[in-house]
Interface confidence: low
C-alpha cells in the first residue's frame, strides 16, 4: 500500500485545516493507529494526536480542542485530522506515520501555510492646495502573510512608491500616492485596492480628494456702460468667482463707503435708482480659507441731459 | 452553527443611551471581525460599525462617528455597541453579524435583530 497526502494545505486565518493522510492499502490490510506529529526543521518533533482503531482520538495537551477528525461517515484506512481555527503559529511542517497491519509502517510529511489576509488602513496626507507641487495624497497599509499587493485605482494622474517591511510571519506594504493638486481633482475618488490570496475579492478604500483653490475674481454687470445712466433701476454688479472651500464674498468702495441704498447680497451689489453719487470705484473681496482675490470696477453714471447738452453741430466755415 | 443573539434595544428619548449586546454560540468567534448593521423602514440595511476579532481596530460609518463605541469581550463570545446621543434618525432595528475569516461581505452569520426606537 501507499500513503497519499498533499505536499502543501492552505488555509485562511482562522479556518480550519484539514490534514490529509489516507492509506491505500491491499485487500485485507487494516490501519492500526495514526500519530500526527509537528516536524519543524531543528526542532524535535511535537505529537499532534494519536487515532488508535480501538481507543479512539488521543490529542496532546498542547492542542486540546483544536485537533478532531472530520465528520462521519469515516473510512478506517483514513488518518486526516482537522486543525482548528489555524493560526500563524500554526504553520509548519507535519508528518503522519500510518500503522497497518501486515504491511508495517509508512510515513509522509506535509506543509501547513497559513494565509492572513490583510486588514488594510488608507490615511489621506497633508491638506492638497492647489500651486502644490507634487504632495502626497494618501498612503495605504496593509499586513499580512504573504505579503499583500497594495495598488491604487483612480482617474486622477499621480505616482506611486511602494515600500514593504518584513515581519517574522507577515509583511507590512505601503503605498503612497503624490500627485500635483488641481481645482480639477475636487470631489475624485482615490482607491486603494489591496489584493491577497487569503481574500475572496480584493479589498478596496476609498478616499475623496479635497484640493483647496480661489479662482481669479471678476465683476459682470457693466459689460454695456450706456445702461448706467441716471434714473436706471435695478442696476446690481455680480462679483464672479469659485473655490474650495465656496468662498465669501465682500463690497466696498474705493474712494468713499457705499452709498445709501446699495444693497449687498452675498456676491452681488444691488443699486436703487442710479445717480451721480453712484459714480466710483468699487470692488469686490473674495476670500476663503486657502487665498483672497480682489477685482474692481469703474462705475460711470451718465447723464443723458448732459450728454445732448455738450453735442455740438459742426458747421463748416470758409 | 453559529448563532448570534441581540438584546438591549428599545424605546429611548433623543439625546439618551442604549447598550446593545450579541452573544454567540455554537463557535468561538475570536479570530473573526464582527459588526453591527442597522435598518430602518423602508431603507437597506446599513452597516454601523465593525471591530477586528481581537478588538484593536473599529470602523464606523459617518453618521455615527462619536456617538456609537463597538468593543468585544471574546471571553464571553459577546459583542457590545454603545449608542449615546441618540437621536431620532437612529430608529432602525439593529442586527449583529460575524464576517467568518474576515473576508469579503457575503460570508456572513446574522442574528435576528433587536428594535432600538428614538422618540420623544
Known amino acids: 500500500g501507499e500513503l497519499e497526502t498533499s505536499d502543501v494545505v492552505t488555509v485562511v486565518l482562522g479556518q480550519d485545516a484539514k490534514l490529509p493522510c489516507f492509506y491505500r492499502g491491499d485487500s485485507g490490510e487494516q490501519v492500526g493507529q495514526v500519530a500526527w506529529a509537528r516536524v519543524d526543521a531543528g526542532e524535535g518533533a511535537q505529537e499532534l494526536a494519536l487515532l488508535h482503531s480501538k481507543y479512539g482520538l488521543h490529542v496532546s495537551p498542547a492542542y486540546e480542542g483544536r485537533v478532531e477528525q472530520p465528520p462521519p461517515p469515516r473510512n478506517p484506512l483514513d488518518g486526516s485530522v482537522l486543525l482548528r481555527n489555524a493560526v500563524q503559529a500554526d504553520e509548519g511542517e507535519y508528518e503522519c506515520r500510518v500503522s497497518t497491519f501486515p504491511a508495517g509502517s509508512f510515513q509522509a510529511r506535509l506543509r501547513l501555510r497559513v494565509l492572513v489576509p490583510p486588514l488594510p488602513s488608507l490615511n489621506p496626507g497633508p491638506a492638497l492646495e492647489e500651486g502644490q507641487g507634487l504632495t502626497l495624497a494618501a498612503s495605504c497599509t496593509a499586513e499580512g502573510s504573504p505579503a499583500p499587493s497594495v495598488t491604487w485605482d483612480t482617474e486622477v494622474k499621480g505616482t506611486t512608491s511602494s515600500r514593504s517591511f518584513k515581519h517574522s510571519r507577515s509583511a507590512a506594504v505601503t503605498s503612497e500616492f503624490h500627485l500635483v493638486p488641481s481645482r480639477s481633482m475636487n470631489g475624485q475618488p482615490l482607491t486603494c485596492v489591496v489584493s491577497h490570496p487569503g481574500l475572496l475579492q480584493d479589498q478596496r478604500i476609498t478616499h475623496i480628494l479635497h484640493v483647496s483653490f480661489l479662482a481669479e475674481a471678476s465683476v459682470r454687470g457693466l459689460e454695456d456702460q450706456n445702461l448706467w445712466h441716471i434714473g436706471r433701476e435695478g442696476a446690481m454688479l455680480k462679483c464672479l468667482s469659485e473655490g474650495q472651500p465656496p468662498p465669501s464674498y465682500n463690497w466696498t468702495r474705493l474712494d468713499g463707503p457705499l452709498p445709501s441704498g446699495v444693497r449687498v447680497d452675498g456676491d452681488t451689489l444691488g443699486f436703487p435708482p442710479l445717480t451721480t453719487e453712484h459714480s466710483g470705484i468699487y470692488v469686490c473681496h473674495v476670500s476663503n480659507e486657502f487665498s483672497s482675490r480682489d477685482s474692481q470696477v469703474t462705475v460711470d453714471v451718465l447723464d443723458p441731459q448732459e450728454d445732448s447738452g455738450k453735442q455740438v453741430d459742426l458747421v463748416s466755415a470758409s | 452553527e453559529v448563532q448570534l443573539l441581540e438584546s438591549g434595544g428599545g424605546l429611548v428619548q433623543p439625546g439618551g443611551s442604549l447598550r446593545l449586546s450579541c452573544a454567540a454560540s455554537g463557535r468561538t468567534l475570536s479570530s473573526y471581525a464582527m459588526g453591527w448593521y442597522r435598518q430602518a423602514p423602508g431603507k437597506e440595511r446599513e452597516l454601523v460599525s465593525s471591530?477586528?476579532?481581537?478588538?484593536?481596530?473599529?470602523r464606523y460609518a459617518d453618521s455615527v462617528k462619536g456617538r456609537f463605541t463597538i468593543s468585544r469581550d471574546n471571553s464571553k463570545n459577546t459583542l457590545y455597541l454603545q449608542m449615546n446621543s441618540l437621536k431620532p434618525e437612529d430608529t432602525a432595528v439593529y442586527y449583529c453579524?460575524?464576517?467568518?475569516?474576515?473576508?469579503?461581505?457575503?460570508?456572513?452569520?446574522w442574528g435576528q435583530g433587536t428594535q432600538v426606537t428614538v422618540s420623544s
Open positions: 453579524a460575524v464576517y467568518i475569516l474576515e473576508l469579503a461581505p457575503g460570508a456572513e452569520y
Open positions: 471591530i477586528s476579532g481581537s478588538g484593536g481596530s473599529t
